[in-house]
């Protein structure tokens, strides 16, 4: 059994999250994850989910009673999602920490927008780029 | 030329983001994107970048002078990053809108944590799962 399982059960007790009523009104993440089988689509969704958990854990960082559980789960997330790669984790953390209300950050983001956009679609790296762009013009929602 | 280019240039003027000093102290996104060649790694990073831009655009939704530019860019982001797939975009938006301070959301998130974690590594979806779990005991990052 992975180390996170026991610690997640501990968090369930702490958050009173074991009751069946918690599942009322559908799931947060599981239903969405079920929709996406493609690895790259899953990474798009999981990126948001992982950043949510890291934010949640940050909010409880001073609560000693769950510290060990939180640290163990974070460690296992780093192993599983970032493949134990600290550079990947650090780059991710930088992105999640940028403040959208900081004027300098806003200016930089707009300054970089054209280049970011050019790299957004997987096709951006291949010769298929131009043709797929033209298809989109004619049948915008066909994908 | 893609429609977003002209509109992004318009935003650059609005945000005074065309000056060379904007590039001081390094980039926000471009340096990070340069580090990751693997498509799934790129999606992890781009997911955070795209959510940043959507948040930024939301903050300026009442500014009529850039409305057309923002809408054009958002539409092109939906084409490029979400492959024109509205369901993908909607699921993404749901994830970005969950409030980390909402008690019900917290309980649900903790309730789903074990299953979310089980799906985090790419091996989780394949027949390799059981065997890789055992390999992980010996060499956790072997996948």
């Amino acid at each position: 059994q992975d180390p996170y399982v026991k610690e997640a059960e501990n968090l369930k007790k702490y958050f009173n999250a074991g009751h069946s009523d918690v599942a009322d009104n559908g799931t947060l993440f599981l239903g969405i994850l079920k929709n996406w089988k493609e690895e790259s689509d899953r990474k798009i969704m999981q990126s948001q989910i992982v950043s949510f958990y890291f934010k949640l854990f940050k909010n409880f960082k001073d609560d000693q009673s769950i510290q060990k559980s939180v640290e163990t789960i974070k460690e296992d997330m780093n192993v599983k999602f970032f493949n134990s790669n600290k550079k990947k984790r650090d780059d991710f953390e930088k992105l999640t920490n940028y403040s959208v209300t900081d004027l300098n950050v806003q200016r930089k983001a707009i300054h970089e927008l054209i280049q970011v956009m050019a790299e957004l679609s997987p096709a951006a790296k291949t010769g298929k780029r131009k043709r797929s762009q033209m298809l989109f013009r004619g049948r915008r929602a066909s994908q | 030329q893609d429609p977003y280019v002209k509109e992004a240039e318009n935003l650059k003027k609005y945000f005074n983001a065309g000056h060379s000093d904007v590039a001081d102290n390094g980039t926000l996104f471009l340096g990070i994107l340069k580090n990751w060649k693997e498509e799934s790694d790129r999606k992890i990073m781009q997911s955070q970048i795209v959510s940043f831009y959507f948040k930024l655009f939301k903050n300026f939704k009442d500014d009529q002078s850039i409305q057309k530019s923002v809408e054009t860019i958002k539409e092109d982001m939906n084409v490029k990053f979400f492959n024109s797939n509205k369901k993908k975009r909607d699921d993404f938006e749901k994830l970005t809108n969950y409030s980390v301070t909402d008690l019900n959301v917290q309980r649900k998130a903790i309730h789903e944590l074990i299953q979310v974690m089980a799906e985090l590594s790419p091996a989780a979806k394949t027949g390799k799962r059981k065997r890789s779990q055992m390999l992980f005991r010996g060499r956790r990052a072997s996948q």
Epitope: N83 | K37, D41, G138
Partner: antibody, heavy 120, light 111 residues
Framework: EVQLLESGGGLVQPGGSLRLSCAAS????????MSWVRQAPGKGLEWVSA????????YYADSVKGRFTISRDNSKNTLYLQMNSLRAEDTAVYYC?????????????WGRGTTVTVSS | NFMLTQPHSVSESPGKTVTISCTRS????????VQWYQQRPGSSPTTVIF?????PSGVPDRFSGSIDTSSNSASLTISGLKTEDEADYYC??????????FGGGTKLTVL
């Protein structure tokens, strides 16, 4: 001040076993991954194994996989390396090293090393 | 698996600048952090650069690290060379499964 003190080295015959220990102090032991790195006489550094802060994740070089086992006791601030089926090519100084992060990430502090000699 | 290739030895005079390269044979040099370790004769290694270009406290700013994606290599630069810099220098990074890889080491001689 960070201190790492290795012990347990010595002379052993091929096929034999040894258990190395590394006593750590001066930092929150469970918050950092730990590694074993070795250096054969007159040769370069060779990474052997690493273990995450909780002990939940372990990593091994191909040359030792299946023969060596890394473990840690966070209550005792101690790192271990159980070495079985030893070979002549395992002869080296074995360094215990503290990593920068909770998962293997490069080392910021190294012990003085303990010498393992495998010979008949 | 990839290799990290370093020059076997380099030499330079005191006060000068020397650069030691570390070339990754496959996979991107940028996809994992690179560390540099100094090992003086008869001593344990010490870290002079971590996470591509960061210096641990106590390491003088004469030591700097960089990575170059075009040559897929990392570099350690030591300026204002001193005799005490004479040592073996090792670069280190990780493969895609996060197993640790060391370069073969470079013997720096200060003439």
């Amino acid at each position: 001040e960070v201190q790492l003190l290795e012990s347990g080295g010595g002379l052993v015959q091929p096929g034999g076993s040894l258990r190395l220990s590394c006593a750590a102090s001066g930092f929150t032991f469970s918050s950092y991954a730990m590694s074993w790195v070795r250096q054969a006489p007159g040769k370069g550094l060779e990474w052997v194994s690493a273990i995450s802060g909780s002990g939940g994740s372990t990593y091994y070089a191909d040359s030792v996989k299946g023969r060596f086992t890394i473990s840690r006791d966070n209550s005792k601030n101690t790192l271990y390396l159980q070495m079985n089926s030893l070979r002549a090519e395992d002869t080296a100084v074995y360094y215990c090293a503290k990593d920068f992060w909770v998962i293997t990430s490069g080392n910021d502090y190294w012990g003085r090393g303990t010498t393992v000699t495998v010979s008949s | 698996n990839f290799m990290l290739t370093q020059p076997h030895s380099v030499s330079e005079s005191p006060g000068k600048t020397v650069t030691i390269s570390c070339t990754r044979s496959s996979g991107s040099i940028a996809s994992n952090y690179v560390q540099w370790y100094q090992q003086r004769p008869g001593s344990s290694p010490t870290t002079v650069i971590f996470e591509d270009n960061r210096r641990p406290s106590g390491v003088p700013d004469r030591f700097s690290g960089s990575i170059d994606t075009s040559s897929n290599s990392a570099s350690l630069t030591i300026s204002g060379l001193k005799t005490e810099d004479e040592a073996d220098y090792y670069c280190q990074s990780f493969d895609s499964t996060n197993l640790v890889v060391f370069g073969g080491g470079t013997k720096l001689t200060v003439l």
